[in-house]
């Protein structure tokens, strides 16, 4: 028998140094967790004790905290290269720059191999990316080898900016051809890494013919054996085993998300190449495991262009932005506006000639919004700015819900009107109008919302039985300020890009803003 | 300034032993994997073998398994290659090349020692 | 014997486009890299291109590479006297499990 350990990360999403257990920026140092120079620590201490050892990341390093805004994936291949990962699969965030952004900081300048089996380049785009991402590679692992075969969510093109140049093909048809190739280099232990959420990994262990390893990402999916750590609710065992179509049983991992846990997986072969057995857990890098002093280092030298760009103008605004919470729980604030209309704005994707976008519309949570910004100060608009107005680190995510859904968040948003409470709804490409003086759970009067089906936007009533994609935070999305009804009916979620990132880059697009307040949402009293 | 430099080969009878020691300096060594590459008088360039930057990974060339091992010291920014039961056909300049890549040894060589000469002769 | 096969020698003179060729499979150029070296007599190897077609710093742009399929090539544009020398094409072999190093092109500039 082989034995392979296999250490892997997923989602890590910019998160280079240590956070706070919310995996929100690190406040008491004791008490944070993750971050880079601690993964270290923990993949050499594994290293130097067992002998076949890799360490992947199934994608998405990219996007979410100021480290990805201003240095642009550089740090990624800077740290990924100083850690010594030996593959990497690339996710739907890796194309948030565009290909540009993915082909100079990262596929040129990392030294491990990055892949996708599902992802096929045409046009000019073909000769300018060849070798530089590939559909799998066979790693040599003490004196064998083992076949890595990559794969990338094919919702990417509406997630992210990955342009007309690039395909992305079914996953488990995409994938089982790169199987067979490996198989006729008799290459007979095979991983499937991949960023397509933990339903299609498990697809993938069942469909795919000579995969025997899954690990994967996406879905933030925390899987543990025993009782769990930390405040995660593990989906279920790690590894998570799925018997194939042709009956071998296929362990699939993943790792939760911002380098908080460091994936643990001990794989036993035959000679053949099939699993004899499988077990681990993830590894929960908190402030007992010390961060590595060299990595800190560097860390620390990376991060003194973070201090300065944070302090920089992005933008201007000609009026007063009120994000106060007077305002934001009570009506529709101009600050609400802003925001919403941002992130709109970054989900713009022309993918089909039908629509003029495949999402028109946001809810953001009023408590979200924790601070006004002053035009006053010349206008002027700095990162430090907006980081007090969404303090929280989170991500404006893509979800699809049925209207039925949408309709009973906005009765969930007045439903105690009038204590100041963050449930209160601001919103993009809606117009609502409540009545107060009915009773809570039916103050809802009108609700209307802008099509995506059509060459003229316009805002049409919505319908209860229709599916809807929104832009909202992820707050929302996990049923926060109450919203249980979005987490438990929500039919898809990916998540999406720094809140703060989102903002500051459609000021520093538009130069100039001026949000008005402009009867998004109304109230009424009497009959309709 | 970036520098290889091989020492240990000579003249041996065929079935005999031999190690050759390659210096690194001007680089961090354990950052990159590392090759033995050789060429035999008048022929085209021949991989021996390999390591990546942790010993982890190691791979050789058909023509040399079983009979050749190569090893690192990372303390010591030193390759090696142990070279048992030579043959006639193992006659070459060997080289040692630095990889562009620390991991599985299938980068680019862009370092390179002026070599060491290794003669199997009866 | 080599798994990549290049033409033994080419030839242009000085100022022409001249292009070597080298044939692969898919367990090589099919699916890997391919690196470029250059060794001019009684000297070391060195590197001209790697990963397809990125060059190191201090290697003209006059050099380029390229592949396609199972199939590679170094063109060289406005060749110079001393470009002639012995070229390589060389990359990871998916099957012997081993890097392996094309047959060597001996280039003359006329």
């Known amino acids: 028998a082989w034995e392979l350990t296999i250490l892997h990360t997923n989602d890590v999403h910019s998160r280079l140094e240590q956070t706070s257990e919310d995996s929100s920026k690190c406040v008491n140092a004791s008490r944070c967790m993750g971050g880079v120079a601690r993964l270290f620590t923990k993949v050499q201490q594994i290293r130097r004790a067992e002998p076949n050892v890799l360490l992947l990341d199934a994608g998405d390093q990219y996007q979410g905290t100021i480290w990805f805004t201003v240095y642009k994936g550089a740090e990624v291949a800077h740290f990924m290269n100083a850690l010594r990962y030996d593959a990497m699969a690339l996710g739907n965030h890796e194309f948030d720059n565009g290909v540009e952004g993915l082909i100079e900081p990262l596929l040129k300048e990392a030294k491990f191999p990055i892949l996708s089996a599902n992802i096929k380049a045409k046009g000019p785009l073909a000769s300018q990316i060849s070798g530089l991402y590939l559909p799998y590679k066979v790693l040599p692992v003490g004196d064998e080898v083992v076949g890595i075969v990559g794969y990338t969510s094919k919702e990417t093109p509406f997630l992210s900016n990955p342009g007309t140049n690039l395909v992305f093909e079914d996953e488990i048809t995409a994938l089982q051809p790169e199987v067979d190739k490996l198989k006729t280099l008799n290459v007979n232990k095979i991983i499937a890494l991949g960023h397509s959420g933990f339903e299609m990994d498990k697809l993938i262990a069942q469909k795919v013919r000579g995969v025997d390893v899954v690990v994967g990402g996406h879905s933030n999916t925390f899987l543990y054996t025993g009782n769990p750590p930390s405040k995660e609710v593990p989906a279920g065992k790690y590894p998570f085993i799925v018997t194939s179509d042709d009956g071998r049983k296929v362990p699939v991992v993943q790792a939760y998300a911002f380098g908080k846990y460091l994936g643990y997986l001990k794989i036993e072969f035959d000679e053949r190449g099939n699993v004899i057995s499988s077990h681990g857990n993830p590894i929960l890098l908190n402030s007992s495991i010390p961060e590595d002093p060299s990595i800190k280092a560097d860390i620390n030298k990376w991060r003194i262009k973070l201090d300065n760009y944070s302090t920089q103008e992005l933008g201007k605004t000609i009026v007063y932005l009120d994000g106060s919470s007077q305002s934001c729980r009570f009506r529709e604030c101009n600050m609400g506006n802003l925001i919403c209309d941002a992130m709109i704005n970054n989900n713009l994707r022309h993918t089909d000639e039908m629509f003029w976008n495949h999402v028109s519309m946001c809810i953001l949570n009023g408590g979200g919004i924790r601070s006004p910004i002053d035009e006053r100060n010349n206008g002027t608009i700095t990162w430090e700015n907006l980081a007090a107005v969404l303090p929280f680190g989170g991500t404006f995510d893509l979800v699809q819900l049925k209207g039925s859904t949408l309709k009973k968040a906005f009765e969930h948003s007045v439903h105690r009107y009038g204590q100041s409470t963050g449930e209160f709804l601001q919103v993009g490409g809606i117009h609502v109008v409540y009545d107060l003086s009915r009773k809570p759970g039916d103050r809802v009067v009108k609700l209307d919302v802008l099509c995506t089906k059509c060459r003229v936007p316009s805002y049409d009533p919505l319908k209860m039985d229709e599916v809807y994609k929104v832009i909202l935070p992820n707050f929302l999305a996990n049923g926060g300020d109450g919203f249980q009804m979005i987490k438990d009916e929500l039919l898809r979620h990916d998540s999406g890009d720094q809140d703060i990132n989102v903002v500051s880059t459609y000021i520093s697009k538009m130069k100039v803003i001026y949000p008005a307040v402009e009867g998004r949402i109304k109230f009424s009293t009497g009959s309709h | 300034q970036l520098q290889l430099v091989e020492s240990g080969g000579g003249l041996v009878q065929p079935g005999r032993s031999l190690r050759l020691s390659c210096a690194a300096s001007g680089f961090t060594f354990d950052d990159y994997a590392m090759h033995w590459v050789r060429q035999a008088p008048g022929k085209g360039l021949e991989w021996v073998s390999g390591?990546?930057?942790?010993?982890?990974?190691?791979g050789y060339a058909d023509s040399v398994k079983g009979r050749f091992t190569i090893s690192r010291d990372n303390a010591k920014n030193s390759l090696y290659l142990q070279m048992n039961s030579l043959r006639a056909e193992d006659t070459a300049l060997y080289y040692c090349a630095k990889d562009i890549w620390y991991g599985g040894f299938f980068g680019a060589f862009d370092i390179w020692g002026q070599g060491t000469m290794v003669t199997v002769s009866s | 014997q080599s798994v990549l096969t290049q033409p033994p020698s080419a030839s242009g003179t000085p100022g022409q486009r001249v292009t070597i060729p080298c044939s692969g499979s898919?367990?090589?150029?099919?699916?890997?890299?391919v690196y470029w070296y250059q060794q001019f007599p009684g000297t070391a190897p060195k590197l001209l291109i790697y990963?397809?077609?990125q060059r190191p710093s201090g290697v003209p742009d006059r050099f380029s590479g390229s592949k396609s399929g199972t199939s590679a090539s170094l063109a060289i544009a406005g060749l110079r006297s001393e470009d002639e020398a012995d070229y390589y094409c060389?990359?990871?072999?998916?099957?012997?499990?081993?890097?392996?190093f094309g047959t060597g092109t001996k280039l003359t500039v006329l």
């Open positions: 898919s367990s090589n150029i099919g699916t890997n890299s």
């Open positions: 390591i990546s930057w942790n010993s982890g990974s190691i």
């Open positions: 990963r397809n077609f």
């Open positions: 060389a990359g990871w072999d998916d099957s012997v499990r081993g890097y392996v």
